[in-house]
């Protein structure tokens, strides 16, 4: 997935570190893992596990890895080329409309309802009407029945800002 | 709440040029990402451009390296895409994007960001 790259994300270095490794761009753009120098003629390579570029680009700066928050597991580590994936820990999820932060699953559905879904690290319990079938929308449900759910395993990892 | 205007889209041949624009609305998109996605027939939506904030750099997809060029007026809230040698394989509608909050790295086409409409690219002879 691509990220679209904001103020906060933009790693505090100006100057290269010695060891970084130089080449040249390429149509004035350099390849991921790197950025361009400030005069245009170098691509500096990114520093493994600080910062990083996804695309090519004429950035001033790699983009800073994105730490994973409490609450959060990491999936796999920031590398040159990949910002870190992070992903909501066994019973909550994140939904699109607040990245955010992982919110916990429900633990059952409301009465009259049934559930088809499982807690995933996107998504929460999944509830249909008993005789409709039509899904529930609500947020948290006024009455909850016994039914619960046991968190669903995975099917692919949800990253937050890869 | 943003809203997103594409314009610009149009049928060109093969080698030509079109200049997309995305006005912007609702507030202000100087400290904000903003990008461009596409969606040709029957394929996925995928990534073509993004723009950093103040003038910080641009990241490109390597199918688009060196054809198109991403930039932004952020006093007129406006994005463009100047898209030169095009091919037939550009043909798709595309997507003016913006990031919700300046704080987060905001996803891609499944993540938390601001949709335009979309304006349609047709490449053929």
């Known amino acids: 997935e691509s990220a679209l790259i904001t103020q906060q994300d933009l790693a505090p270095q100006q100057r290269a570190a010695p060891q970084q490794k130089r080449s040249s761009p390429s149509e004035g753009l350099c390849p991921p893992g790197h950025h361009i120098s400030e005069d245009g003629r170098d691509c500096i390579s990114c520093k493994y596990g600080q910062d990083y570029s996804t695309h090519w680009n004429d950035l001033l700066f790699c983009l800073r890895c994105t730490r994973c928050d409490s609450g959060e597991v990491e999936l796999s580590p920031c590398t040159t080329t990949r910002n870190t994936v992070c992903q909501c820990e066994e019973g909550t999820f994140r939904e699109e409309d607040s990245p955010e932060m992982c919110r916990k699953c429900r633990t059952g559905c409301p009465r009259g309802m049934v559930k088809v879904g499982d807690c995933t690290p996107w998504s929460d319990i999944e509830c249909v009407h008993k005789e409709s079938g039509t899904k529930h929308s609500g947020e948290v449900p006024a009455v909850e029945e016994t039914v619960t759910s046991s968190p669903g395993t995975p099917a692919s990892p949800c990253s937050l800002s890869g | 709440e943003v809203q997103l205007l594409e314009s610009g889209g149009g049928e060109v041949q093969p080698g030509g040029s079109l200049r997309l624009s995305c006005a912007a609305s609702g507030r202000s998109i100087s400290n904000y990402a903003m990008g461009w996605f596409r969606q040709a027939p029957g394929k996925e939506r995928e990534f073509v451009s993004a723009s950093v904030w103040n003038n910080a750099g641009n990241y490109y997809a390597e199918s688009v390296k060196g054809r198109f060029t991403i930039s932004r007026d952020d006093a007129k809230s406006t994005l463009y895409l100047q898209m030169s040698s095009l091919r037939a394989e550009d043909t798709a509608v595309y997507y003016c994007?913006?990031?919700?909050?300046?704080?987060?790295?905001?996803?891609?086409?499944?993540?938390?960001?601001?949709w335009g409409q979309g304006t349609l690219v047709t490449v053929k002879p």
């Open positions: 994007v913006v990031a919700r909050t300046p704080e987060t790295p905001i996803t891609s086409a499944r993540g938390a960001n601001y």
